[in-house]
Interface confidence: medium
């Protein structure tokens, strides 16, 4: 056993060396180690094959060091590794795309607070067993296409506290099991209408504290299981272009935050959800540095980047747009998806309402958190709700013009790569 470490065999073969002032990965770690705890030291570099002898390793904690470099082959041979915690290494900044290759059993990967500025191509390739991916509190500015494509079992993705300015079409492709997506406290100004296409099992979506002034309801349509949605602290523009989102929120059977309007001035601070349909009139004039919501054909956009507003005919320029009645959104399913429809990432079987950690269910629209976390798992997700259908575009009956609201065929199909401020 290395000098600064404590080694023991029960309940698992463990080499524990936390907060010992180590400046390098110690030599002489027992080859039989199943768990290695090296957190809280001064380790700056993980050389190639540092743990190659530890074929039975399942848990490796290297968090809270001063890692600046991890060799691409640092974790070679760790085919049984299940948990890897590299968090709180702010000098790391980048990770070689090959670093995690071969970790086919990895189910939890902590890369939060690592100063990461980008996710290299193929960084998460082959991590088919991954269930929890912590990427929060980094300096990520973009979500490259297909970054998470191989993560078909991922249930929790934490991306909050970064500098992400847009959510492109292919950012979340392949995440068919995703239960929780935390994107709050970023700079997101644009969500592509198809960005969430694969997220049919998503139950929790946090987009609060971003730079959104609109959100295409087409993006929300695939979220059949969505139960918790937070959209507060964004510069929402509550004019005719917000009608589809307003209609969607009226029909949403889960729990959602307030959606406070920024524009027009007369509605500033009011909750979009609590407005009447006829409050959402005309076009708000931008007075602030609003960012593109999506990029489309130039003729379908205003300089703001918002979708083009409902415009009266040339002969009727002086008139104020009258709100049309929102088109029927179809019959949103009343019942919930059965609890087992979106199984917990830990494979412990279906979740039921009675599994609530708090034990009681205060209201039918507010299902509780689910509870039991088997050993080795991460905290739980939420029960699911029934699917909802996207509302249609509102038409101004007495003119030929109609709303451009970012739905299919309305000029809202670009990828949108605008920068946040």
């Amino acid at each position: 056993c290395p000098g600064a470490c404590v080694c023991y065999n029960e309940p698992k073969v463990t080499t524990s060396c936390p907060q010992q002032g180590l400046q390098a990965v110690p030599v002489g770690i027992p080859a039989a180690s199943q768990r290695i705890f090296l957190h809280g030291n001064r380790i700056s570099h993980v050389p190639a094959a540092s743990f190659r002898a530890c074929r039975n390793l399942t848990i490796l904690w290297l968090h809270s060091n001063v890692l600046a470099r991890i060799d691409a082959a640092a974790f070679t041979g760790l085919a049984l590794l299940e948990q890897l915690d590299l968090s709180d290494n702010a000098q790391l900044r980048s990770v070689d795309p090959a670093t995690f290759h071969g970790l086919g059993r990895l189910h939890t990967l902590h890369l939060d607070r690592c100063g990461l500025q980008e996710l290299g191509p193929g960084l998460f390739r082959g991590l088919a067993a991954l269930q929890y991916l912590y990427l929060q509190d980094n300096a990520l500015q973009a979500l490259p296409d297909d970054t998470f494509r191989d993560l078909g079992n991922l249930t929790h993705l934490f991306l909050h506290g970064n500098r992400i300015s847009s959510v492109p079409e292919r950012a979340f492709r392949g995440l068919h099991s995703l239960d929780r997506l935390l994107l709050h406290q970023n700079r997101v100004a644009h969500v592509h209408p198809h960005a969430f296409r694969d997220l049919g099992r998503l139950m929790t979506l946090y987009l609060f504290a971003n730079n959104l002034s609109a959100l295409p309801t087409e993006a929300l349509a695939p979220l059949r299981a969505l139960q918790y949605l937070r959209l507060n602290d964004n510069p929402w523009v509550c004019d005719c272009r917000a009608r589809p989102l307003w209609a969607w929120l009226q029909k949403f059977r889960g729990s959602s935050s307030e959606v406070p309007c920024s524009l027009p001035q007369r509605l500033a601070g009011r909750d979009l959800k609590r407005l009447a349909a006829n409050d959402l009139q005309g076009c708000a004039v931008a007075t602030g540095p609003y960012h593109p919501i999506w990029t489309g054909r130039a003729t379908d956009e205003e300089p703001l980047g918002l979708p083009k507003c409902c415009q009266p005919d040339a002969a009727d320029k002086a008139s104020v747009l009258e709100p049309g009645r929102p088109a029927s959104a179809g019959n949103a399913l009343k019942g919930r998806v059965p609890p087992g429809d979106s199984p917990p990432g830990n494979g412990s079987g279906p979740r039921h309402i009675n599994d609530s950690p708090f034990g009681t269910l205060p209201g039918s629209a507010e299902p509780p958190l689910t509870a039991v976390r088997p050993e080795g798992s991460e905290p739980p997700g939420f029960p699911t709700s029934g699917p909802r259908r996207r509302p249609g575009c509102s038409r101004k009956n007495r003119t030929r013009s109609h709303c451009r609201l970012g739905q299919a065929g309305s000029g809202g199909g670009g990828t949108g790569d605008s920068e946040g401020s």
């Epitope: 936390p18 705890f37 957190h39 809280g40 904690w61 939060d112 912590y134 929060q136 929790h156 934490f158 909050h160 935390l182 709050h184 929790t204 946090y206 918790y228 507060n232 729990s255 935050s257 609530s356 950690p357 708090f358 034990g359 009681t360 205060p362 209201g363 507010e366 299902p367 509780p368 958190l369 509870a371 039991v372 976390r373 088997p374 050993e375 080795g376 798992s377 991460e378 905290p379």
Partner: antibody, heavy 124, light 107 residues
Framework: QMQLVQSGGGLEQPGRSLRLSCVTS????????MHWVRQAPGKGLEWVSG????????GYADSVKGRFTVSRDNSKNSLYLQMNSLRAEDTAVYYC?????????????????WGQGTLVTVSS | DIQMTQSPSSVSASVGDRVTITCRAS??????LSWYQQKPGKAPKLLIY???NLQSGVPLRFSGSGFGTDFTLTINSLQPEDSATYYC?????????FGQGTKVEIK
Amino acid sequence: QMQLVQSGGGLEQPGRSLRLSCVTSGFNFNDYAMHWVRQAPGKGLEWVSGISWNSGAIGYADSVKGRFTVSRDNSKNSLYLQMNSLRAEDTAVYYCARDYNYEISGYYYGFDNWGQGTLVTVSS
Amino acid sequence: DIQMTQSPSSVSASVGDRVTITCRASQGISRWLSWYQQKPGKAPKLLIYAASNLQSGVPLRFSGSGFGTDFTLTINSLQPEDSATYYCQQTNNFPYTFGQGTKVEIK
């Protein structure tokens, strides 16, 4: 500066009711689950009740279930504990505590801020 | 409910000593364990979260380790101000449960 200021404790007879309040400041109350923890004289800590950020999930220890009700008013940054059918064994110092919970952070951080405590004495 | 068993129930040690407190869960709780320090007449103070993460402002002589069912709080080089009662708390599922406490006294 972060503060959790409690009130509402005192002496009450068995079978009667009390309502505890916890008014917070210095942080975004909306983002946190909140809890009540109590400590009987000379004893250890006991979790009493918890409520999620949006009141969507609420729970109680078996010892108080059916008698105590936790609630919150996010517009007033306030947490409440309504205690009915009080018993002698409910005598304790009651603390409110902030839980920087997993729903917001991705980590469970524990109860990182506590109120000053308020003494509830149940006696005839 | 998950039972948390702390040992020892009390310990007396000298300034500069290393003190170890253990906490055992009745079932596996992954890393979801917190440690608190409480001094007489005061509210508890969070020391360690998620088994091994030091809360901001807590001296480096405190450290936590463990996973699953067995956890340890270590105070390296005990200081006079460390005289207090220490509690573990499982946060794996509700109801959250505390250990019965370990009283640390300075000889």
